[in-house]
């Protein structure tokens, strides 16, 4: 018979004949022949192959490097890779999450507009007039200046975007 030029799904062409691909989780040991089937072997510990394949080596599971702020979200199997995610307090540098960085803190004079998530950084905003932040924080919003009037006190020192007002007693007229 005429040697094939194309093979069915889950097959590959070699030496003018169609051989079965190895299933996910297995690697190729030897091609099929006229008389024998394709020989495949399971991937070893910490290895995987996620497609029907003719690979002679399995891929190593991804290492979730703590130096890059990564931790294991889902352990790999012989058919799937390990999935990494960011440590608490870190966020991915891209959608694929190949590395993470610490959430940015908002400097004094700035407050947190939006708290960071695993995929997005802290969003800071400048404290408007009447509000302040005197700390560098990834959580603190701008705080309103203390209302001296409600405490029956007067402003002794004006507030800034980094400091609260300083209240003091009202000057009393001496008898």
């Amino acid at each position: 018979p005429e040697p094939p030029t194309a093979c069915r799904e889950k097959q590959y062409l070699i030496n003018s004949q169609c051989c079965s691909l190895c299933q996910p989780g297995q690697k190729l040991v030897s091609d099929c022949t006229e008389f024998t089937e394709t020989e495949c072997l399971p991937c070893g510990e910490s290895e995987f192959l996620d497609t029907w394949n003719r690979e002679t080596h399995c891929h190593q599971h991804k290492y979730c490097d703590p130096n890059l702020g990564l931790r294991v979200q889902q352990k790999g199997t012989s058919e799937t890779d390990t999935i990494c995610t960011c440590e608490e307090g870190w966020h991915c540098t891209s959608e694929a999450c190949e590395s993470c960085v610490l959430h940015r803190s908002c400097s004094p004079g700035f407050g947190v507009k939006q708290i960071a998530t695993g995929v997005s950084d802290t969003i800071c905003e400048p404290c408007p007039v009447g509000f302040f932040s005197n700390v560098s924080s990834a959580f603190e919003k701008c705080h309103p200046w203390t209302s001296c009037e409600t405490k029956d006190l007067v402003v002794q020192q004006a507030g800034t975007n980094k400091t609260d007002v300083v209240c003091g007693p009202q000057d009393r007229l001496r008898a």
Partner: antibody, heavy 116, light 108 residues
Framework: EVTLKESGPVLVKPTETLTLTCTVS????????VSWIRQPPGKALEWLAG???????YYASWAKSRLTISRDTNLKQVVLTMTNMDPVDTATYYC??????????WGQGTLVTVSS | AFQLTQSPSSLSASVGDRVTITCQAS??????LAWYQQKPGKPPKLLIV???NLASGVPSRFSGSGSGTDFTLTISSLQPEDFATYYC??????????FGGGTKVEIK
């Protein structure tokens, strides 16, 4: 063993389009991204573009309009095209494993000369 | 546009010297900074990730520090094989994935 190998023309003419291919082995493009980085002779490294393991493409802002990065996960190849080549684009072009991250694995690089 | 400024661009030092290279980011990148060593005709080699963590197989004489916008690479006692060019790289986000201009460490 993880390997990355760049291939493409060694000489291109000004105004032509450069097409470079990075062929990888030892890892899956579904698990790791790949970036292209170049280095003009005697100059600094320049990050050009990256493609994430999820297929997301990223480009250096200064070269965005000239670059296209794509991949074929079955062929284990990542392709970079750069249009309107100029002599200042003469450089060694490297591919490295990783998208927006650090690059622990690099190809050996391919020198591309732009000259008429 | 985001920039990484490395200094000095070159330095001369002797074996045994303590060498310090700085890298300044034009905006905060948290600790999303890496350092590389490159020798002529070779691709760069990763030294430091996350601003201060030694990459696998890198000698302990190399150290990194810094966060935000200011970063430092230190070689505590320069060895003959350390004469090379060093680069910093930011990976905080796609818009700030950039290499510094390099620092060439030469023999005095």
């Amino acid at each position: 063993e993880v390997t990355l190998k760049e291939s493409g023309p060694v000489l291109v003419k000004p105004t032509e389009t450069l097409t470079l291919t990075c062929t990888v082995s030892g890892f899956s493009l579904s698990s790791y991204g790949v970036s292209w980085i170049r280095q003009p002779p005697g100059k600094a490294l320049e990050w050009l573009a990256g493609i994430g393991s999820d297929g997301s493409a990223y480009y250096a802002s200064w070269a965005k309009s000239r670059l296209t990065i794509s991949r074929d996960t079955n062929l284990k190849q990542v392709v970079l095209t750069m249009t309107n080549m100029d002599p200042v684009d003469t450089a060694t072009y490297y591919c490295a494993r990783g998208g927006i991250t650090v690059y622990a694995m690099w190809g050996q690089g391919t020198l591309v000369t732009v000259s008429s | 546009a985001f920039q990484l400024t490395q200094s000095p661009s070159s330095l001369s030092a002797s074996v045994g010297d303590r060498v310090t290279i700085t890298c300044q980011a034009s905006q905060s990148i948290s600790q999303g900074l890496a350092w590389y060593q490159q020798k002529p005709g070779k691709p760069p080699k990763l030294l430091i990730v996350g601003a201060s963590n030694l990459a696998s197989g890198v000698p302990s004489r190399f150290s990194g520090s810094g966060s935000g916008t200011d970063f430092t690479l230190t070689i505590s006692s320069l060895q003959p094989e350390d004469f090379a060019t060093y680069y910093c790289q930011s990976y905080f986000s796609s818009s700030s994935t950039v290499f510094g201009g390099g620092t060439k460490v030469e023999i005095k």
